[in-house]
């Protein structure tokens, strides 16, 4: 109860040039505190200073990366200060160029199955960090495999549940500067599929169209889905539309594909706004073929 609690807002992973608030909370309401940094480069603005409630630190540089603790003022202690708080590790990103993040076999993962997240770079990173958006806990630390072309790490994640789904990024770092991180990889949305019954997918005017003709794919279900997602086989990404309640009691979204030049196998999924990374089973595949064009798939 006498030891304060240190936290970082909005989080412990901070982009170079941004600000971070270090908040030291005392259960007993001792509002004044001191901050110390245990490792890495010294941060002069912390020394011989007393802060009240919180400290806005920044613009952050690589020198700010490291482990922080706070002590709250404590009138009954011989030193006038409490015992040190929990450690908070501040990691500064943007120091090295970004790695790439991929999912194998793909970012749509069946409920209960496993996905491999692969983070790789042409920089020789000894460490990688995997971070899920919206999570305040420290990112997952992974040991990189070094090779001539750079470095990589494979992280096996599963069995897949809605709790594991989300937007992931990875960072790279080198051993002698563990809290100075690369820029984040591009975000990767990991989606758990198969949580709800499959919707139906149909094409208007039909699944076989002339090259250049307009086609609309309709995804519908009696489930109260908020959003439908349309994906094309062998293509990354998806189209997303809000579901609309139809007179016949189904929830439907119409995807206008415009003038089509080549076909392919399409599937759609339903999801709810509250759980954007948790989708239904896929609809049965709908092959759209284009006539008067050499490429059918």
């Amino acid at each position: 109860q006498d030891k304060p609690f240190l936290s970082a807002w909005p989080g412990t992973v901070v982009s170079e040039g941004q600000h971070v608030t270090l908040q030291c909370r005392s259960r007993l309401g001792f509002n004044e505190f001191s901050l110390s940094k245990e490792d890495g480069m010294p941060v002069p603005e912390l020394y011989n200073r007393i802060f009240r409630n919180s400290f806005l630190m920044g613009p952050v540089t690589p020198a700010h990366a490291g482990t922080y603790r706070c002590c709250s003022s404590h009138p009954h202690s011989p030193t006038g200060w409490s015992a040190p708080s929990n450690p908070v590790v501040i990691m500064v990103t943007g120091v090295h160029r970004k790695p790439s993040l991929l999912a194998h076999p793909g970012p749509l993962v069946k409920s209960g199955e496993t996905v491999i997240l692969q983070c790789w770079s042409d920089v020789r990173f000894e460490r990688f960090l995997l971070h899920r958006e919206g999570i305040t806990e420290d990112p997952l630390r992974l040991v990189g495999q070094l090779h001539d072309a750079g470095s990589q790490v494979n992280y096996s994640m599963g069995p897949m549940t809605p709790a594991l789904a989300g937007t992931y990024r990875c960072f790279g770092s080198v051993t002698h500067l563990p809290y100075e991180l690369s820029a984040p990889s591009d975000p990767l949305d990991i989606v758990v599929v198969g949580l709800y019954g499959k919707p139906s997918l149909s094409a208007q005017p039909g699944p076989t169209v002339q090259a250049g003709e307009n086609v609309t794919l309709s995804c519908s279900s009696r489930s109260l889905f908020d959003i439908y997602h349309l994906s094309r086989e062998a293509e990354a990404g998806e189209l997303r539309l809000t579901a609309v309640l139809r007179v016949n009691g189904t929830f439907q979204a119409n995807f206008p594909l415009g003038p089509v030049t080549h076909g392919g196998n399409y599937r759609c999924f339903g999801s709810f706004r509250a759980l954007p990374h948790a989708w239904s089973d896929p609809s049965d595949p709908l092959p759209v073929s284009v006539t008067g064009n050499s490429r059918h798939l």
Partner: antibody, heavy 119, light 107 residues
Framework: QVQLQQSGPDLVRPGVSVKISCKGS????????MHWVKQSHAKSLEWIGV????????NYNQKFKGKATMTVDKSSSTAYMDLARLTSEDSAIYYC????????????WGQGTLVTVSA | SIVMTQTPKFLLVSVGDRVTITCKAS??????VAWYQQKPGQSPKLLIY???NRYTGVPDRFTGSGYGTDFTFTISTVQAEDLAVYFC?????????FGGGTKLEIK
Amino acid sequence: QVQLQQSGPDLVRPGVSVKISCKGSGYTFTDYAMHWVKQSHAKSLEWIGVISTDSGTTNYNQKFKGKATMTVDKSSSTAYMDLARLTSEDSAIYYCARDSSYYVRFSYWGQGTLVTVSA
Amino acid sequence: SIVMTQTPKFLLVSVGDRVTITCKASQSVSNDVAWYQQKPGQSPKLLIYYASNRYTGVPDRFTGSGYGTDFTFTISTVQAEDLAVYFCQQDYSSPWTFGGGTKLEIK
């Protein structure tokens, strides 16, 4: 379940002292700090102070320094508050309240002890 | 110490009404504000902490919002059992201070 059981009402003469007790049960007493709060018609709710049930460290609202003294007896899981040199201004309901974390200050409250100061 | 000014002091409402109570802090308190309900003859009960987080077991008709100096507490659909006095409290800096209270009465 968590319970904070306070001592009964007190009718006291001006100038004397009173000791209110608050017994915690249904949880580990020394894991949570204990607060005292005054409720009077004139001033709504006022925080008096907090005591660490583990170390006995106290932090008082400046306004109540010299008026209130908080103590704990770990062996009986009881927190106490002494109110000294009572005047009619001290007539109020006094609550003990337990915290839950660094972010939840007054999560469980005792039933309150009515102190009436009257000649 | 930080002064919490709560308005209105009294509210006369019907069952089913939407009710909003505001609290203004004399200086910024970040999002360190809690809201309490005190029914007649009872102790205060925590409803909202950290400005917008509902405490365990609190019905979702009670919501809180705000940051800095201006905070709002809302009951989306008043029920007969919501007859009580509601208090805001800043949790930012000791001495922790309370608003003057809002007495909710049902028509």
